[in-house]
């Protein structure tokens, strides 16, 4: 058993039918002695009697408020939150997989620069009694601080018969380096709570590893004099970081038809215009990726060729 | 080229092998995110690489103020990755395919390791660990962690020579 | 005491369905995930699919997978496994078991036998 | 797929002899196996899991070590209730079950 916050405790329970569970004592926070009474949840039944509660927790009936009272007034309450290991592997009921980039993912980061600044989401098909706490470092033996906001619900989707529910955070490294080669990874470590259950979920990356321009932005497009080429010239995003003589991006240009099935010219440029043939119906879009560390690709910014 | 004494290096030649060393880094080990190299073990064998830390002066301003400290740190890194692409690590098995990038890439970190400091002139280097893994398994999981780290090494590498191939040439 | 049962098996035809069942007692069957397991006539064990508690997660062997269909329904402490296109390679003792991956209380198994 | 191969497949021996079952994973699992018995005609049952933590109310002659690719099942002295097939599974990523490895009277 250990203490997540004040007054509210995790018991580690392996998770099998007929598992002994964990014992657990309990201790009233008062100076009283004599005449102290156990209660828990909503229920009026006395458990027990004495500034100790020894209970065995085995199921979730066994979670909850444990409160200790003297003469109808409430002295002080311990809430159980159950933590469940199943064969070995702490359970993650509350959190979806989002398989990407594989198996057993859960936490998903992004950052769109150098600086330090990075978002995380993640997924759950649970809509109520539902709670998160975020804490991040640089490194975990001897951690460098990460300042995390707290978890908002950003999204909701309908799949399916299923509703899902994305829930996002923004954290800073607080002393962040961007032109320094990273040598510890950054871990996130996210508590979630639904009810009496506790789950952590944990993330560890290098911010190089998670970058993802914005799109290149004021993407325009200068027709060519007696022909069919034009001239797409845009710049970088505003919040890529700067100098961009350090902080270089490369640029796929892409040509598309209407069709999703015709034909699509790609030219690869580090510089921020290219000339390419303008067919009719066709859209130019542009994306942008690191030069120099092949983190992932923007999103495409687009115009119509007419 | 970059001498103890601090004349520049040959900031354009840099930057264009620099940026080859980037993409023989990334053709040579290409599965980023396909195998998560800190969930496995063997975490010493790619601590005693040498970073480009906060305090070795390759960001800009400290570039401008004086790029030897950056170079220099530069330069271990590169004799470093070096030696350890030269090593049993890489040369033994299982056996390199043919045409694997591995050998250009280690013949690029020479040449540019050269453009950095001519004959003669020595920065101190880094001592390389003793690395010699006893399984084929083990060999193959160290060559992928050696250019994982390689990838980030030569990324800042690049940054810093397109910097001044920009901003610091005569 | 723990107990899990299962019912449902029998002989079928190539290509044809079975749904076995497995009935739960002796613990509080919602909370914990379970498992098939199982042992072609002669052979070693292999693993089918496993369940959450919930119902919410479930995973399957290749060997099985878009064929078999794993469910539950907590409210009638009952595990299912529906078993489409069978095949003769299919032919064995089904256990159903707790866990996803350690069992520890199996049941007695029932014989399913795929054959024209 | 993960592959577990037991050996031996077959082993002869009297009561009160130590026996040894090996389990090889064809890459690095942990320590993340389990052991179960199988008498004639009854449902397995699990003796080991983690590698080497004896399930409770299993006698302690039963006893499993080992982690990476090689793990092993020693029973330290045979008795006449374990005469049976012993299988190894692995749970580092899906569920795999060695071969099996049936331990008969000599």
């Known amino acids: 058993i250990w203490e997540l916050k004040k007054d509210v405790y995790v018991v580690e329970l392996d998770w099998y039918p007929d598992a002994p569970g964990e014992m657990v004592v309990l201790t009233c926070d008062t100076p009283e002695e004599d005449g102290i009474t156990w209660t828990l949840d909503q229920s009026s039944e006395v458990l027990g009697s004495g500034k100790t509660l020894t209970i065995q927790v085995k199921e979730f009936g066994d979670a909850g408020q444990y409160t200790c009272h003297k003469g109808g007034e409430v002295l002080s309450h311990s809430l159980l939150l159950l933590h469940k290991k199943e064969d070995g592997i702490w359970s993650t009921d509350i959190l979806k997989d989002q398989k990407e980039p594989k198996n057993k993912t859960f936490l998903r980061c992004e950052a769109k620069n150098y600086s330090g600044r990075f978002t995380c989401w993640w997924l759950t098909t649970i809509s109520t009694d539902l709670t998160f706490s975020v804490k991040s470092s640089r490194g975990s033996s001897d951690p460098q601080g990460v300042t995390c906001g707290a978890a908002t619900l950003s999204a909701e989707r309908v799949r399916g018969d299923n509703k899902e529910y994305e829930y996002s955070v923004e954290c800073q490294e607080d002393s962040a380096c961007p032109a320094a080669e990273e040598s510890l990874p950054i871990e996130v470590m996210v508590d979630a709570v639904h009810k009496l259950k506790y789950e952590n979920y944990t993330s560890s990356f290098f911010i190089r590893d998670i970058i993802k321009p914005d799109p290149p932005k004021n993407l325009q497009l200068k027709p060519l004099k007696n022909s069919r080429q034009v001239e797409v010239s845009w710049e970088y995003p505003d919040t890529w970081s700067t100098p961009h003589s350090y902080f270089s991006l490369t640029f796929c240009v892409q040509v598309q038809g209407k069709s999703k099935r015709e034909k699509k010219d790609r030219v690869f440029t580090d510089k921020t215009s290219a000339t390419v043939i303008c067919r009719k119906n066709a859209s130019i879009s542009v994306r942008a990726q690191d030069r120099y560390y092949s983190s992932s690709w923007s999103e495409w910014a687009s115009v119509p060729c007419s | 080229r970059a001498v103890p004494g601090g004349s520049s290096p040959a900031w354009t030649q840099c930057q264009q092998l620099s940026q080859k060393l980037c993409t023989l880094a990334w053709s040579a080990h290409p599965l980023v995110g396909h195998m998560d190299l800190r969930e496995e073990g063997d975490e010493e064998t790619t601590n005693d690489v040498p970073h480009i830390q906060c305090g070795d002066g390759c960001d800009p301003q400290g570039l401008r103020d004086n790029s030897q400290f950056c170079l220099q740190r530069i330069h271990q890194g590169l004799i470093f990755y070096e030696k350890l692409l030269g090593s049993d690590i890489f040369t033994g098995e299982p056996s390199l395919l043919p045409d694997s990038p591995v050998g250009q890439l280690h013949a690029s970190l020479l040449g540019l390791s050269q453009l950095l400091q001519p004959e003669g002139h020595h920065w101190e280097t880094q001592q390389i660990p003793s690395l010699s893994p006893s399984q084929p398994w083990q060999r193959l999981l160290l060559r992928f962690k050696i250019l994982r780290s390689l990838q980030a090494f030569v990324a800042v590498a690049a940054r810093v020579f397109a910097h001044g191939a920009a901003t610091l040439s005569p | 005491e723990v107990q899990l049962l299962e019912s449902g098996g029998g002989l079928v035809q190539p290509g044809g369905s079975l749904r076995l069942s497995c009935a739960a007692s002796g613990f509080t069957f919602s909370n914990y995930s379970m498992s098939w397991v199982r042992q072609a006539p002669g052979k070693g064990l292999e693993w089918v699919s496993s369940i959450r508690s919930s119902g919410g997660r479930t995973d399957y062997a290749d060997s099985v997978k878009g064929r078999f269909t794993i469910s539950r329904d907590n409210s009638k402490n009952t595990l299912y496994l529906q078993m489409n296109s069978l095949r003769a390679e299919d032919t064995a003792v089904y256990y159903c078991a707790t866990g996803i991956a350690v069992a520890r209380y199996w049941g007695q198994g029932t014989l399913v036998t795929v054959s024209s | 797929d993960i592959q577990m191969t037991q050996s031996p497949s077959t082993l002869s021996a009297s009561v009160g002899d130590r026996v040894t079952i090996t389990c090889r994973a064809s890459q690095n699992i942990g320590t993340w196996v389990v052991w179960y018995q199988q008498r004639p005609g009854k449902a397995p049952s699990l003796l080991i899991y983690?590698?080497?933590t004896l399930e409770s109310g299993v006698p302690s002659r039963f006893s499993g070590s080992g982690s990476g690719t090689e793990f092993t099942l020693t029973i330290s002295s045979l008795q006449p209730d374990d005469f049976a097939t012993y299988y190894c599974q692995q749970f580092y990523t899906s569920k795999t079950f060695g071969q099996g490895t049936k331990v008969e009277i000599k």
């Open positions: 983690k590698a080497s």
